[in-house]
Amino acid sequence: EVKPCDFPEIQHGGLYYKSLRRLYFPAAAGQSYSYYCDQNFVTPSGSYWDYIHCTQDGWSPTVPCLRTCSKSDIEIENGFISESSSIYILNKEIQYKCKPGYATADGNSSGSITCLQNGWSAQPICIKFCDMPVFENSRAKSNGMRFKLHDTLDYECYDGYEISYGNTTGSIVCGEDGWSHFPTCYNSSEKCGPPPPISNGDTTSFLLKVYVPQSRVEYQCQSYYELQGSNYVTCSNGEWSEPPRCIHPCIITEENMNKNNIQLKGKSDIKYYAKTGDTIEFMCKLGYNANTSVLSFQAVCREGIVEYPRCE
């Protein structure tokens, strides 16, 4: 005996013209009726409506409306989904990949989420991670290979090497931009003491007892002294690079000008300072005439020495 099909109770959907059609049930095998699926649900063929068929075994499909999950519901930071489809049906698994430098919670470069009855099984997670760095003159105190954000990796220097000022152990932290710093251990013999003092000048920073290799220290000269050379020195192989010199200024005094019956051209200073290489213009005092060449009245300051012209 052919079993009729009772009125179909379609979860998350229904028959079109349901109230009119109720009269036709139970229905005989072979009968088909159009039906629709609610929002976020689709028919097994992937559309929003289809036909439900009465068969000898009952209604087909047995689950007329399948849950769908939308790609737009996925919030993925620091990763991407390469599949082109925008709608995924129940139990469909979707793959996602993490950007370089990021990994899933279990440390893989890719992961998957599944469309379940209540939506996606989870949101994709791509956590910042740091790979084991390359160590120079040192070794890691951990045998892990991948480290999560905020993880700390301790390391120690080989014998004869240190991190800073006698410390031989250190740690680096995995941050958003990678490791907090590069684990560097330098040869203890390459440290420098305080940089050399210079005459008529000084360092711009307070002095340490020990400087690590590649440290830079800046010098400055006293007022009116001119810095010659680089104003920085660098610690390399236990030695500082050549410090600068502070070149004496030329001090033009009223006494020296009176001796030579001259005065500064266009200036009334009693004392005037000029740097090396500066040109100082003189002229004869009223009632005096030049006793030296015209060129000598444009004197050039050379490391504190200036040759004064003379007027008689």
């Epitope: 240190e162 006698g166 307070f206 340490l208 007892k209 020990v210």
Partner: antibody, heavy 124, light 107 residues
């Protein structure tokens, strides 16, 4: 109790080398947390720091500009002492010479322990 | 180099009084880099204060240091007979230099 014991001649002739030694007891010249200094005191120049030696995985010597070309400070680990050599002395170098310890850290230079001082006269 | 000028040259006070000694630097010295010493006749100097305000081991709390930049002060709150001596300031920011000293004498 840490002590510094100074020794050396009290009279040096001009142009010769002034040499003083400072023996350390209760601490080590190669300590990683101390530096060993020479300071002198005269009526004309007051207290004047001359230089230091210290060990931080390797030996460092730092000298004052005023004596840089004439001074050497040597540590002697076998005897746990350090010495001062100041050459080409003149009567201007007549002073009381103190050896001192500095226990300041990387940045600090201050002297928490002093020897008794040696009066050195430069005279022919 | 940094020149330290101490004032007054001589300070005459009585036991029980408060002493204020000044040390002025020719250029700015971080407060971390100033120390004070006491020297009695025929003796070596003794460290009192380092880092401008930290008392050295065994120094009584009547000694205190303060100041920053170019002006520093050593204060002895209540003078004891053994406090009459010469006091020196010292900077150690760039090389090491000492002040000329202040003689604290009994009035």
């Amino acid at each position: 109790q840490v002590q510094l014991q100074q020794s050396g001649p009290g009279l040096v002739k001009p142009s010769q080398t002034l040499s003083l030694t400072c023996a350390i007891s209760g601490d080590s010249v190669s300590s990683n947390s101390a530096s060993w200094n020479w300071i002198r005191q005269s009526p004309s120049r007051g207290l004047e720091w001359l230089g230091t030696t210290y060990y931080r995985s390797k030996w460092f010597n730092v000298y004052a500009v005023s004596v840089k070309s004439r001074i050497t400070i040597n540590p002697d680990t076998s005897k746990n002492q350090f010495s001062l050599h100041l050459n080409s002395v003149t009567p201007e170098d007549t002073a009381i010479y103190f050896c001192t310890r500095d226990r300041g850290d990387l940045l600090h230079w201050y002297f928490d322990l002093w020897g008794r001082g040696t009066l050195v006269t430069v005279s022919s | 180099e940094i020149v330290l000028t101490q004032s007054p040259g001589t300070l005459s006070l009585s036991p029980g009084e408060r002493a204020t000694l000044s040390c002025r630097a020719s250029q700015s010295v971080s407060s971390s880099y100033l120390a004070w010493y006491q020297q009695k006749p025929g003796q070596s100097p003794r460290l009192l204060i380092y880092g401008a305000s930290s008392r050295a081991t065994g120094i009584p709390d009547r000694f205190s240091g303060s100041g920053s930049g170019t002006d520093f002060t050593l204060t002895i709150s209540r003078l004891e007979p053994e406090d009459f001596a010469v006091y020196y300031c010292q900077q150690y920011g760039r090389s090491v230099t000492f002040g000329g000293g202040t003689k604290l004498e009994i009035k």
